[in-house]
């Protein structure tokens, strides 16, 4: 109620001669600060005296002295809140009731605390879950209701006496609800620790002994059990006994059930101790073990592998990898069930013996296509030899061998003709499916294994042919060698270098740029009349007559090839010059008479001079001189003289006879 | 007469799809291998794809800069080639041709304007 | 383009042109090369296939040559009417797929 003080410390407080003990204390006073504090040793209220009489082993007054034989008892408290207490050493006949009297201005209070101190250190208590299995971690606990800040002691744990390797964890409380030593120790038991005394070992500081507490482990487990065969090595033939017996070691608690186990698969009818096996056979080969229960769980032995002898059964070869690529590795297995594993194997391909291959690999570091077929092995061991299997199939894959590019035409192959050719090939895994050809078309086309080429042109060279399955192989190109007629057939001057003049060496050559076969002919023709056979055409002296059309021709055995038709040009100087008169030689006076300066030149006349019978020069340099009218003076001899860029050219005289008219007759 | 007539040209935005259609007749189209060929305005050719006959595993190739976004397909029955243009972007406007390798002839073409 | 031509060419009636094409060892170099005639507003017209073989219809006037990693297309007697884009075109095995010339415009003047 609300006139009481309120105090918070442990109801009781335990420790041994000679250590120490910490009394942890908090309390409120009603009113004010404390004034006067006493500790005393079982006290008793004195009815007379109003006061409490007992050994007061501490105590404090308003003027704070202390006895100086109090200091193996020391407050640690304070006015208002703190009240604790250490005494140090403690002894054993300070056991019992301490009372720690309060007082302030206007109140008084009596506060009772036990103390429990013993002869001699007294043991901590393990504390155990209710139930150990094996592996199943626990906490075991270890709790020593007793802690001091000037006594150090420590908890140590032991299995069988010897210090357990697990850490364990301790903890200390010196606190107003609980003052303990704690240690706890986290462990997973297996069953071979049943029945095993652990310790929790009390030491001082040094690890002096101080007490202990002991408790025995009842580790719940499995059946542990042991397997013993006979014979003891587990191998045995066909046909022959063999038996094993089941022993428990250990089971806590007690066993229930006994059952066998092969290859982990219960064998029915089979639950006593000893399992026996009569006249085994290659199939009851395998892992055997007994399993024995208790309410934990199965228990099981440990295996026993049961080898039973027997001769390699008809093999069979596993192929890595088939189909192979020519040129990879390949490796071949033989697998034959047998017991003990065979020791020589015999290797055949295609029913053929395959010499010093013992293995039960063989491996084919760079396969060819020569190495497909079947592949079968036999397996021996020390029982005996096995039987051939069906073998298996190696199937290599290779490129199309052997391409060739085939002309099917009969030979020469003229400029024009159809030429077929065909793709052919020697061997091929998997099949062809395909063909390509070069050179190629601008847009790749499906081809057969024959390519049609219509109108071969001249220049048609090689083509190459790829027969393809999953590869291609390409054979070496073929040269068509097309033949054809001389091709670009031209007249050209050799010389001279310069326009020909008359007179001039003149040569001209009839070239080709190409022909197949390379044998030709030459012909030259002017205006359809044969000149020579060679490839040139030679006028020491050219004269106008030799100007003219000129066309070449080159042939071979294909064919014939004009040129175009070439203009060979003379140039010369005016020549047959000559005066005509019109109307004629004779002309009456009066009338008109025109002379014509008549010539041959090329280039043509670019400038005409006249010339009377005294070789005098005419005033007229046209081709015509005209004369009108005609005088009588104008009788006589008259020539002209022609300019080109070439040279000049004169005429012979021309006489022009001009008569009297008859007018002029009759007027004499 | 070989002769190979396209259609399904027309305006699309970019990002956009369409489809070409190309009819041959006068020669065995299913042994063909079809060809697409297109013009950008004012610009060169350019081979865009082909789809190889069934008889040759029908696949079809591509030039780098249509690949992953045309698709090449035919119906032999229908003597038809498709071009199916996705992602369509504003370089891919121009005339498109189809063309047979097997006798080199051309179709008319028909245009595809790829604009915002 | 993977194959070079140049872009323009010109010449008069009866004249003499010749369009250039210049590849590769992987195209032109081992593959045939194919001419083509574009007139304005029409599909491309095959003009010379396998190096220098004419179509039918194809007049002589037009001829193909090839040399190395080279092809060329002549025309003679040059006509108004081949006023026309050409393109030549190869396989080009390293793409497996056929390539053009980026086209040359012929300029009858």
């Known amino acids: 109620d609300s006139s009481k003080w309120v105090f918070e410390h442990p109801e009781t407080l335990y420790a041994w001669e000679g250590a120490c003990v910490w009394i942890p204390c908090t309390y409120r006073a009603l009113d004010g600060d404390l004034e006067s504090f006493i500790l005393f040793h079982n006290p008793e209220y004195n009815k007379n005296t109003s006061k409490f009489d007992g050994t007061r082993l501490y105590e404090s007054t308003k003027d704070g002295k202390v006895p100086s034989e109090q200091k193996r008892v020391q407050f640690l408290g304070d006015k208002n809140k703190n009240c604790t207490l250490s005494i140090h050493p403690v002894h054993l006949n300070d056991s019992g009731q301490l009372g720690l009297r309060m007082e302030s201005k206007t109140e008084k209070w009596m506060e009772r605390i036990h103390l429990n101190v013993s002869e001699r250190p007294f043991p901590p208590h393990i504390q155990l879950p209710p139930e150990i299995q094996e592996s199943q971690e626990v906490t075991l606990t270890c709790l020593l209701n007793f802690s001091c800040y000037g006594y150090p002691i420590q908890l140590q744990w032991l299995l069988e006496g010897v210090p357990m390797r697990q850490a364990a964890v301790t903890s200390t409380s010196l606190t107003i609800k609980s003052v303990f030593t704690r240690s706890e120790l986290k462990f997973s038991p297996q069953w071979s620790h049943h029945g095993k005394i652990v310790t929790c070992q009390l030491q001082d500081a040094d690890g002096k002994f101080l007490s202990n507490d002991t408790v025995q482990l009842n580790v719940k487990h499995t059946p542990k059990l042991e397997i013993k065969v006979t014979p003891s090595d587990a191998i045995v033939r066909e046909g022959d006994s063999v038996t094993m017996t089941c022993e428990v070691s250990s089971s806590n608690p007690e066993y229930t059930t006994v059952s066998w186990l092969k290859d982990g698969t219960s064998l029915k009818k089979q639950n006593t101790f000893t399992l026996n096996l009569r006249e085994v056979t290659k199939d009851q080969s395998g892992k055997y073990c007994c399993q024995v229960s208790n309410d934990v769980g199965p228990g099981r032995s440990e295996e026993v592998f049961l080898q039973v002898q027997y001769a390699p059964e008809p093999s069979t070869v596993q192929i890595l990898h088939s189909p192979a690529v020519e040129g990879s590795q390949v490796e071949f297995l033989c697998m034959s069930l047998a017991n003990p594993l065979p020791t020589n194997y015999t290797w055949y391909h295609n029913g053929k013996e395959m010499q010093g291959r013992t293995e039960e690999k063989v491996h084919i570091p760079k396969i060819l296509p020569w190495h497909a077929g079947t592949y079968s092995c036999v397996a021996e061991n020390i029982l005996g030899t096995g039987q051939r299997g069906p073998g298996a199939e190696l199937d290599v894959q290779y490129p199309p061998k052997k391409v060739t590019t085939v002309i099917q035409n009969p030979m020469p192959i003229r400029e024009g003709d159809t030429v077929t050719l065909s793709c052919n090939y020697n061997s091929s895994n998997p099949s062809v499916t395909r063909y390509e050809w070069k050179p190629h078309g601008a847009w790749e086309e499906p081809s057969l294994g024959v390519l049609k080429i219509q109108n071969v042109g001249w220049d048609n060279t090689t083509i190459a042919c790829a027969a393809c399955n999953s590869w291609c192989s390409w054979a070496s190109p073929v040269a068509l060698n097309v033949q054809y007629a001389p091709r670009d057939v031209r007249v050209r001057k050799i010389k001279p270098l310069s326009e020909i003049h008359s007179g001039n060496s003149v040569s001209l050559q009839c070239d080709f740029s190409s022909s197949h076969p390379k044998e030709v002919q030459f012909f030259w023709e002017k205006n359809g009349r044969l000149l020579g056979k060679e490839s040139q055409l030679n006028f020491d002296s050219i004269s106008p007559e030799d100007a003219g059309s000129y066309s070449c021709w080159v042939n071979n055995s294909i064919g014939q090839t004009a040129s175009k038709a070439w203009t060979l040009e003379v140039l010369y100087a005016p020549r047959r010059l000559r005066v005509s008169m019109s109307p004629g030689d004779q002309v009456m006076e009066g009338k008109s008479a025109t002379l014509t300066c008549e010539s041959d030149a090329n280039p043509p006349v670019s400038h005409y001079t006249w010339f009377d019978w005294n070789n005098q020069s005419l005033p007229y340099h046209s081709q015509k001189l005209r004369l009108e009218p005609v005088k009588v003076q104008h009788s006589g001899a008259y020539w002209c003289q022609g300019t080109n860029s070439v040279g000049k050219g004169r005429s012979p005289l021309s006489t022009l006879t001009v008569y009297y008219s008859p007018e002029t007759i009759g007027r004499r | 007469e070989v002769q190979l007539v396209e259609s399904g040209g027309g305006l699309v935005k970019p990002g956009g799809s369409l489809r070409l259609s190309c009819v041959a007749s006068?020669?065995?189209?299913?042994?063909?291998?079809m060809n697409w060929v297109r013009q950008a305005p004012g610009k060169g050719l350019e081979w865009v794809g082909r789809?190889?006959?069934?008889?040759?595993?029908?696949?079809?190739d591509y030039a780098a800069p249509v690949k992953g976004r045309f698709t090449i397909s035919r119906d032999d029955s229908k003597n038809t080639m498709y071009l199916q243009m996705n992602s369509l972007k504003t370089e891919d406007t121009g005339v498109y041709y189809c063309?047979?390798?097997?006798?080199?002839?051309w179709g008319q073409g028909t245009t595809v304007t790829v604009s915002s | 383009y993977v194959l070079t031509q140049p872009p323009s060419a010109s010449g008069t009636p009866g004249q003499r042109v010749t369009i250039s094409c210049s590849g590769s060892?992987?195209?032109?170099?081992?593959?045939?090369v194919y001419w083509y005639q574009q007139l304005p507003g029409t599909a491309p017209k095959l003009l010379i296939y396998?190096?220098?073989q004419r179509p039918s219809g194809v007049p002589d006037r037009f001829s193909g040559s090839k040399s190395g990693t080279s092809a060329s297309l002549a025309i003679s007697g040059l006509r108004s009417e081949d006023e026309a884009d050409y393109y030549c075109?190869?396989?080009?095995?390293?793409?497996?797929?056929?390539?053009f010339g980026g086209g040359t415009k012929l300029t009858v003047l």
């Open positions: 060892s992987s195209n032109i170099g081992s593959n045939y």
């Open positions: 396998r190096n220098n």
């Open positions: 063309i047979t390798g097997a006798t080199d002839v």
């Open positions: 075109a190869a396989w080009d095995d390293s793409l497996s797929g056929p390539v």
């Open positions: 789809i190889k006959s069934k008889t040759d595993g029908g696949t079809a």
């Open positions: 006068g020669f065995t189209f299913s042994n063909a291998w």
